[in-house]
């Protein structure tokens, strides 16, 4: 006999957008207060009742007069085919499910959405469906006419489908990919017909779990939570992901306005523990992450402020700063970095409650420093605050070093003209701005005879005219605080410089390597002197101080040029501060071939000889050491006499070449000539790196034998 609690009043509604069938029914004959565990078997057929595509047993507890609901999502859009639904019921006896007594089936309920489609010749479903990347999707077309051949395309590529009935074909898309934010285009068209019908399949990239979720407070009033939302789902702003923060201890929840951060008001009742759940959610899915923390362990202090320097002296300064009050009087650890010339020169750690103080010592006078401070929770380190930076300058001190002084002495009309040179003190030596230099000239024969001269900075030279006696010169640098130690130098009328022999040195890319013999007796040091621009009238005098135990040095300068001769003088400085010349060196950083030939004067022309001379040719001003000269002689006969050799010039002309090996020999007699003959000559200097240019030859014709001299 049929079960008394059969399903009745079965109603089926549809939700096309979600491709869902909603079933609603009731069970009669149940007393109002009665509860019964029941199972309902639901069958769904497609196209015809015999084509069952879904069977499901739905178990629930039924109360009297209760409306029951069940939903089913169809893979195939509901518009694509008729669906039929029926159900039956049984009492749910879990102990013997195989012995269930089923009620009769309800009558089939038919759902046919196609009836409401309208009168167009072609439809494509589903419309504007939103799916996740990687999903499988079924689409279909419904045609109002059976005659036409219909083709469907996915992004322009024809799809293979399967016919459900003469008017309907369906297409299964597997593992759909994200193509563009405006969706994937699918369209169908009648092959020889009218129009195209398209749908858009909106494909979302899979919503990612938020990464690096973290919260912190800067002021104990607001918790700032941040996270990395991961890759964008690729959907335009109509259906983006939303983010929600839920805190379980307080039970509060907030919808975040931004994709990657959210603020949470700290409870005034001093809640210490927080248990947050961050939920990312879009139309298709939810993703959650959790963090549990103690508020005092997540303090990211605000940057210190009011950074000041007091009691700034020559070598010390007291740095003070304030930190923002947090209400909870816990200790901050502050880190101080002191910068000098852009580099960290000191690091300090200081514990601070409200005000910080630190004495910076070991500083240089008149130096600009920069100090920066940042703070973090001392008990539970979380994050450093931002740095706060402030500059200060130490106080000036008297210059600490004597200026580096040298001189140039010339005798002019019985007087001694002394040009004094000094190098500016370095910043570390000057200890402040140098305002002037004091020069004291002391006559060593008359110690009471003092001359004082003041030269304003930034001058680096002065000229003194003295008589031929010995003088001691003191030079000091002065700033607003005081005077430097003095540089002392003795000058006398006769420097005795000229008796020293000059020695040649070979320069390299690195400069000139100079060495000298050590001097016996008391010597305080050596000075090497040279000119950076020897061809200029002012010559740019340079000097280098060396210790008493040094007998070699390398002199290098950016001013050194190839083809320029540099002259070096090495002086010893006696204990009485008297400089005396020890050695002279001369050389080239790089020798170049001679650039011009001597201006030659011809004389004593006879029928058999003539004399060539080039007395005013200066070998010192040449771009290399001149080793000698070549005299070239061209003649019609082309014969070369002893003492000369045949030479072929660059223009293939042949001549005779005479070689002079002494650079001081600036005269040459060309002999063995024929009377009334035509000759051409050229004189070129030569050096280790080449000879002068083969320019124009000078023409000469010898007279007959009887012509007067």
């Amino acid at each position: 006999e049929p079960l008394p609690w059969a399903p009745e009043s079965l109603k089926v509604s549809i939700n096309s957008t979600h491709q869902c069938l909603h079933l609603q029914w009731s069970v009669h004959n149940l007393a109002y207060h009665q509860e019964l565990k029941m199972v309902f078997q639901i069958e769904i057929s497609r196209i015809k009742t015999s084509n069952v595509i879904w069977v499901e047993n739905y178990s629930t507890t039924v109360k009297g007069n209760q409306l029951l609901h069940w939903s089913w999502e169809s893979q195939l859009p509901l518009e694509c085919a008729k669906h039929f639904i029926r159900m039956r019921s049984a009492v749910d006896d879990a102990t013997t499910p195989e012995q269930r007594f089923w009620s009769n089936w309800s009558s089939w309920e038919e759902v046919d959405v196609q009836n409401s489609l309208g009168h167009e010749p072609l439809f494509v479903f589903p419309k504007d469906k939103l799916v996740e990347e990687g999903s499988n999707v079924t689409i279909c077309y419904v045609s109002r006419s059976q005659q036409n051949n219909i083709s469907c395309y996915l992004e322009g590529v024809r799809m293979q489908g399967q016919q459900l009935d003469p008017n309907v074909s369906m297409f299964n898309l597997h593992n759909v990919a994200f193509i563009r934010e405006t969706g994937t285009n699918i369209y169908c068209k009648v092959d020889r017909g009218d129009d195209i019908k398209g749908i858009v399949l909106f494909v979302s990239k899979i919503l990612e779990e938020p990464k690096d979720f973290s919260c912190e407070t800067r002021d104990f009033q607001t918790l700032s939570c941040t996270w990395d939302p991961g890759r964008d789902t690729g959907l335009l702003k109509q259906l983006p992901q939303s983010y929600t923060l839920f805190e379980s201890f307080s039970g509060k929840k907030t919808l975040c306005k931004h994709k990657g951060w959210c603020n949470w008001q700290v409870a005034p009742e001093s809640q210490e523990m927080y248990n947050f759940t961050l939920t990312a959610e879009n139309y298709l899915r939810k993703r959650s992450v959790h963090i549990l923390f103690n508020l005092t362990h997540r303090v990211h202090p605000m940057a210190p402020f009011n950074v000041l320097f007091k009691d700034v002296s020559v070598t010390n300064a007291t740095m003070t700063w304030k930190v923002h009050s947090t209400g909870n009087y816990y200790t901050l650890l502050c880190q101080v970095e002191l910068y000098g010339e852009g580099k960290v020169i000191q690091k300090h750690n200081v514990s601070v409650k409200v005000n910080g103080e630190l004495v910076l010592s070991g500083l240089e006078p008149d130096t600009e420093y920069s100090a920066q401070v940042r703070c973090a929770n001392a008990n539970h380190f979380w994050k450093w605050s931002e740095w706060t930076r402030q500059n200060f300058t130490t106080v000036e001190a008297a210059p600490s070093e004597a200026p580096d002084v040298w001189r140039n002495v010339k005798s002019v009309q019985g007087y001694c003209v002394v040009t004094l040179f000094w190098k500016p003190l370095s910043r570390l030596q000057a200890n402040g701005e140098i305002l002037f230099y004091n020069i004291v000239v002391e006559d060593l024969d008359r110690p009471s005879g003092l001359q004082l001269l003041s030269v304003p900075a930034p001058a680096n030279r002065t000229e003194l005219t003295l008589d031929q006696r010995a003088y001691q010169i003191h030079v000091t640098a002065n700033n607003s605080v005081g005077t430097s130690p003095a540089s002392v130098l003795v000058v006398s009328g006769d420097p005795g410089d000229e008796e020293v022999e000059e020695e040649r040195v070979k320069g390299t890319e690195d400069g000139f390597s100079l060495s000298w013999k050590p001097q016996p007796g008391n010597i305080t040091g050596y000075i090497v002197e040279w000119c950076d621009r020897p061809r200029d009238p002012l010559c740019d005098l340079q000097w280098k101080h060396l210790g008493p135990n040094t007998t070699s040095t390398v002199i290098s300068s950016d001013a050194f040029r190839p083809g320029v001769r540099y002259n070096f003088r090495i002086y010893g400085i006696s204990t009485e501060m008297v400089p005396y010349l020890l050695e002279k060196k001369t050389g080239y950083s790089q020798e170049l071939a001679p650039s011009d030939n001597p201006r030659v004067v011809m004389s004593n022309l006879t029928s058999h000889s003539f004399t060539l001379s080039w007395k005013d040719y200066s070998t010192e001003s040449q771009p290399s050491f001149i080793r000698g000269y070549h005299v070239y002689l061209k003649s019609k006969a082309g014969q070369c006499h002893p003492g000369s050799e045949k030479a072929v010039l660059s223009d293939d002309s042949v001549c005779c070449k005479y070689k002079i090996d002494d650079p001081k020999q600036k005269m040459f007699v060309v002999g063995n000539l024929q009377p009334e003959s035509f000759y051409e000559f050229l004189v070129t200097p030569y050096s280790a790196v080449g000879e002068g240019p083969h320019g124009a030859f000078t023409k000469v014709t010898t007279p007959d034998e009887y012509s007067p001299m």
Epitope: T17, L117, G118, H119, E120, F123, K127, D128, Y153, E155, G156, R180, E181, T182, G183, N185, Y187, D195, I196, K197, G198, V200, F202, L236, Q238, L239
Partner: antibody, heavy 118, light 107 residues
């Protein structure tokens, strides 16, 4: 036959507002996405806005975002374009289009002229 | 924005001629290229969509081809009624953009 008829043309001052309508007939309006496309006095065509068949998806050109609103009434078979904060560069002939494929304007109305001038 | 360029702004041809109008995209548009015809009275019609598919009611003398960034519209046998301005348009990437148009005239 597909028929799209725009209306609402007018002369507006800069900063003013105007609402355009497009009456659709000859097809099931609710089945199709629709767009507005305009043609400037220099005869350049510019896509303005798009709305999906159900109205869930709406896109705008950057030049009109925040000033123009596209909407549809499927019961009335009508497409709308609410234009506000109008600028002189919005002066154009506005066409309503039916889009069977996203970004393809298969059928066009005859156009309605909007002039923005002081 | 993706730029569409029609290098020829006007073109003269004789009736019966084979005419080709070209269009270049500033980046790959995956064949989402449409061609429109605008008659002198302002009427606009879709001729070809998805590079080469003829829209319903469009004569078969019209054809389209291309890929990547270079596309063209060909009229194989020019007729009087084809006198119009032709626009290309990409539908691959927002914002959807049009070429500047090519005006076709009779010699």
């Amino acid at each position: 036959d597909v028929k799209l008829v725009e209306s609402g043309e007018g002369l507006v001052k800069p900063g003013g507002s105007l609402k355009l309508s497009c009456a659709a007939s000859g097809f099931t309006f609710s089945s199709y996405a629709m767009s507005w496309v305009r043609q400037t006095p220099e005869k350049r065509l510019e896509w303005v806005a798009y709305i999906s068949s159900g109205g869930d998806y709406i896109y705008y050109a950057d030049t009109v975002k925040g000033r123009f609103t596209i909407s549809r009434d499927n019961a009335r078979n009508t497409l709308y374009l609410q234009m506000s904060s109008l600028k002189s560069e919005d002066t154009a002939m506005y066409y309503c289009t039916r889009d069977p494929i996203t970004g393809t304007f298969a059928y066009w109305g005859q156009g309605t002229l909007v002039t923005v001038s002081a | 924005d993706l730029q569409m360029t029609q290098t020829t702004s006007s073109l003269s041809a004789s009736l019966g001629d084979r005419v080709t109008i070209s269009c270049r995209a500033s980046q790959d548009i995956n064949n989402y290229l449409n061609w429109y015809q605008q008659k002198p009275d302002g009427t606009v019609k879709l001729l070809i969509y998805y590079t080469s598919t003829l829209h319903s009611g469009v004569p078969s003398r019209f054809s389209g081809s291309g890929s990547g960034t270079d596309y063209s519209l060909t009229i194989s046998n020019l007729e009087q009624e084809d006198i119009a301005t032709y626009f290309c348009q990409q539908g691959n990437t927002l914002p959807w953009t049009f070429g500047g148009g090519t005006k076709l005239e009779i010699k």
